[in-house]
Interface confidence: medium
């Protein structure tokens, strides 16, 4: 039977190699049943994830999944780093795995890592039963 837990389908150690100056959309695939949860993005600073308050975000709804998108218009060199999306659902916090952006300055584009180098690990999508309160370690 279908689970009605909120699920955040972010790749475990997923990575994106992107160019500064380009537009980019970072997607957080969100699966929910009835009420869409409140979702936010944050950027990791050491062990702390700093909420991104004043950034353009949007929802894209598809048949079986929704995407909460963080827009980079354009990508800036200091956008380099790891990001995480979080969902508030029935007073519980559900956190995704982090996804890392490797931003290459256009001037040094020839030094960009290849796609193969970026694909460091397989997928693991992160699920939490909504009745389990979760503190990410």
């Amino acid at each position: 039977k279908e689970s009605c837990d909120v699920q955040l389908y972010i790749k475990r150690q997923s990575e994106h190699s992107i160019l500064a100056g380009d537009p980019f959309e970072l997607e957080c695939p969100v699966k929910y049943c009835a009420n869409r949860p409140h979702v936010t993005w944050c950027k990791l600073n050491g062990t702390t994830c700093v909420k991104l308050e004043d950034r353009q975000t949007s929802w894209k709804e598809e048949k079986n999944i929704s995407f909460f998108i963080l827009h980079f218009e354009p990508v800036l060199p200091n956008d380099n780093g790891s990001y995480r999306c979080s969902a508030n659902f029935q007073s519980n916090l559900i956190e995704s795995h982090s996804t890392t952006l490797y931003v290459t300055d256009v001037k040094s584009a020839s030094e960009r890592p290849s796609k193969d180098e970026m694909a460091s690990r397989p997928w693991l999508l992160y699920r939490h039963h909504h009745h389990h309160h979760h503190h990410h370690h």
Epitope: Y9, K11, R12, Q13, P29, S120, R121, L124, L125, H137
Partner: antibody, heavy 121, light 112 residues
Framework: QITLKESGPTLVKPTQTLTLTCTFS??????????VSWIRQPPGKALEWLAH???????RFNPSLKSRLTITKDTSKNQVVLTMTNMDPVDTATYYC?????????????WGQGTLVTVSS | DVVMTQSPLSLPVTLGQPASISCKST???????????LNWLQQRPGQSPRRLIY???KLDSGVPDRFSGSGSGTDFTLKISRVEAEDVGVYYC?????????FGQGTKVEIK
């Protein structure tokens, strides 16, 4: 009921390309989080993971064989196809496909019966 | 790559007696999500592998409770409390925490 079944040639010549098909039922690769792996086992030896494909066509390969491997899926046919180029006698093995879902609780929970591929001239 | 080392490689056992297989990894298998992706598989003679245990200690449905898994970090153990004839075969550990996924070299369990 979940089943997987491998099919392909039993004998290939050195330097040829091997194409294997995994036909499965009881789950769909169009379902979010679903995936299928290929694993091989040379006669009398241990298992070796080769490649994995996910519902969204994301692919992962064993780096030691990546340059020789291709993995594709046909969601409508419930099939995953593995191709391995430049076959060598050391590639003689039983090739298995197995299911691997996103939550870690279904990594390799269902396996096919395997198909023995012999590489010989 | 993470190397999975099993011991012993051959394990002659007496029916009804316990058996234990060790699996050691060259890196910790504790993932950032708090889970440890360590499975045990059984391969009976002439058959395809069958998963017995996942996430270190969770038994697959249909697996007799004489099988148990334990361990953490880099050291893991599969135990059979009382070996039965149908337990003969090769047992593999597998890790899915680090890419590429890797298997142990196998432990052959046979009856004395």
């Amino acid at each position: 009921q979940i089943t997987l079944k491998e099919s392909g040639p039993t004998l290939v010549k050195p330097t040829q390309t091997l194409t294997l098909t995994c036909t499965f039922s009881g789950f769909s690769l169009s379902t979010f989080g679903m995936g299928v792996s290929w694993i091989r086992q040379p006669p009398g030896k241990a298992l070796e993971w080769l490649a994995h494909i996910y519902w969204d066509d994301d692919k992962r390969f064993n780096p030691s064989l990546k340059s020789r491997l291709t993995i594709t899926k046909d969601t409508s046919k419930n099939q995953v196809v593995l191709t391995m180029t430049n076959m060598d006698p050391v590639d003689t093995a039983t090739y298995y496909c197995a299911r691997g879902n996103w939550d870690g609780e279904t990594y390799f929970d269902y396996w096919g019966q395997g198909t023995l591929v012999t590489v010989s001239s | 790559d993470v190397v999975m080392t099993q011991s012993p490689l051959s394990l002659p056992v007496t029916l009804g007696q316990p058996a234990s297989i060790s699996c050691k990894s060259t890196q910790s298998l504790l993932d950032s999500d708090g889970k440890t992706y360590l499975n045990w598989l059984q391969q009976r003679p002439g058959q395809s592998p069958r998963r017995l245990i996942y996430l270190v200690s969770k038994l697959d449905s249909g697996v007799p409770d004489r099988f148990s898994g334990s361990g953490s970090g880099t050291d893991f153990t599969l135990k059979i409390s009382r070996v039965e004839a149908e337990d003969v075969g090769v047992y593999y550990c597998w890790q899915g925490t680090h890419f590429p996924w890797t298997f142990g070299q196998g432990t052959k369990v046979e009856i004395k």
